[in-house]
């Protein structure tokens, strides 16, 4: 069976302040079962941006229907971007466990924020 891959097709995305940013991510398989999470940064201090199974993330919406049983598109849209949102975002697949176990990370997408046009 082919090993699961997490694909973030864009290395970088540039968005004007106040607009929405779309960060793309797809997985090549739903197996092993487990959630997808988005983080900004790496290592123990990374910031959780979106969790597929729990939490309240008012500025983040999934691009595709997350309740589809065969959904493998885990792209997200972040609204009302500010300069504080700049950074590299990683889409990370976990497999189920207690706690869930990190399995595979995408290569990351760097978000840069342009000044709002005057």
């Amino acid at each position: 069976e082919e090993e699961l891959q997490v694909i973030q097709p864009e290395k970088s995305v540039s968005v004007a302040a106040g607009e929405s940013a779309t960060l793309n991510c797809t997985a090549t398989s739903l197996i092993p079962v487990g959630p997808i999470q988005w983080f900004r940064g790496v290592g123990p201090g990374r910031e959780l941006i979106y969790h597929q199974k729990e939490g309240h993330f008012p500025r983040v919406t999934p691009v595709s229907d997350p309740t589809k049983r065969n959904n493998m598109d885990f792209s997200i849209r972040i609204s009302n971007i500010t300069p504080a949102d700049a950074g590299t975002y990683y889409c990370v697949k976990f497999r189920k466990g207690s706690p869930d176990v990190e399995l595979k990370s995408g290569a990351g997408t760097e978000l840069s924020v342009r000044a709002k046009p005057s």
Epitope: P32, K53, P66
Partner: antibody
Framework: DVQLVESGGGVVRPGESLRLSCEAS????????MSWVRQAPGKGLEWVAG???????YYGDSVKGRLTISRDNSKNILYLQMNSLTAEDTAVYYC???????????WGLGTLVTVSS | SYELTQPPSVSVSPGQTARITCSGG??????YAWYQQKPGQAPVTVIH???KRPSDIPERFSGSSSGTTVTLTISGVQAEDEADYYC???????????FGGGTKLTVL
């Protein structure tokens, strides 16, 4: 509080049709996948069908082609259209809210469908 | 698809620990849940996602998994726990939900 209230059950003859409804309240219905699960008298639970928030549908092997799940997100109602009913469809039909990973966290009280000549 | 196998019945004295097992499915492609059903009532979810307990379910209910077997453990069983317990699974390969045949828990 999450509430799921089924209706539309009753006694029908073999070959006839019936439409079940499940009215949902206490949560954002349009954001949740939903399912129908049935239980024949004295038997165990059987998953019938599921539907995503965007209305992608999934069916158990025993009902494909005869039963159709649908939803109206503007009215917070889940439906099950049942055609060409047979005695084997006699059961209590429950609607259930799905968790993020397609298990069930809340159940309705059920509605009884009896198919008898 | 796959089958989930449970013992038809389990008996336990009040205050003792009851364990109900469920085997079948593939650990890596399946999430499991446990549903309690008392006579004439709708099912109630006592465990989902293998080991997650809803907030309104007593702490004496717990779930665990080992290989292809999942277990519902009820510690300090009470008379009110007498019910049928169904193991349920969702298979990420087939997109299908499956239930075990149910286990009747009798509190002696």
């Amino acid at each position: 509080d999450v509430q799921l209230v089924e209706s539309g059950g009753g006694v029908v003859r073999p070959g006839e049709s019936l439409r079940l409804s499940c009215e949902a309240s206490g949560f954002t219905f349009s954001s949740n996948a939903m399912s129908w699960v049935r239980q024949a008298p004295g038997k165990g639970l059987e998953w019938v069908a599921g539907i995503s928030s965007g209305s992608d549908t999934y069916y158990g092997d025993s009902v494909k082609g005869r039963l159709t799940i649908s939803r109206d997100n503007s009215k917070n109602i889940l439906y099950l259209q049942m055609n060409s009913l047979t005695a084997e469809d006699t059961a209590v039909y429950y609607c259930a809210r799905e968790t993020w990973n397609h298990l069930f966290d809340y159940w309705g009280l059920g509605t009884l469908v009896t198919v008898s000549s | 698809s796959y089958e989930l196998t449970q013992p038809p019945s389990v008996s336990v004295s009040p205050g003792q620990t009851a364990r109900i097992t469920c085997s079948g499915g593939d650990y890596y492609s399946t999430y499991y849940a446990w549903y309690q059903q008392k006579p004439g009532q709708a099912p109630v979810t006592v465990i989902h996602s293998d080991d997650k307990r809803p907030s309104d379910i007593p702490e004496r209910f717990s779930g665990s998994s080992s290989g292809t077997t999942v277990t519902l453990t009820i510690s300090g069983v009470q008379a009110e726990d007498e019910a049928d317990y169904y193991c349920g699974g969702y298979d990420g390969r087939t997109y299908i939900n499956t239930f075990g045949g149910g286990t009747k828990l009798t509190v002696l």
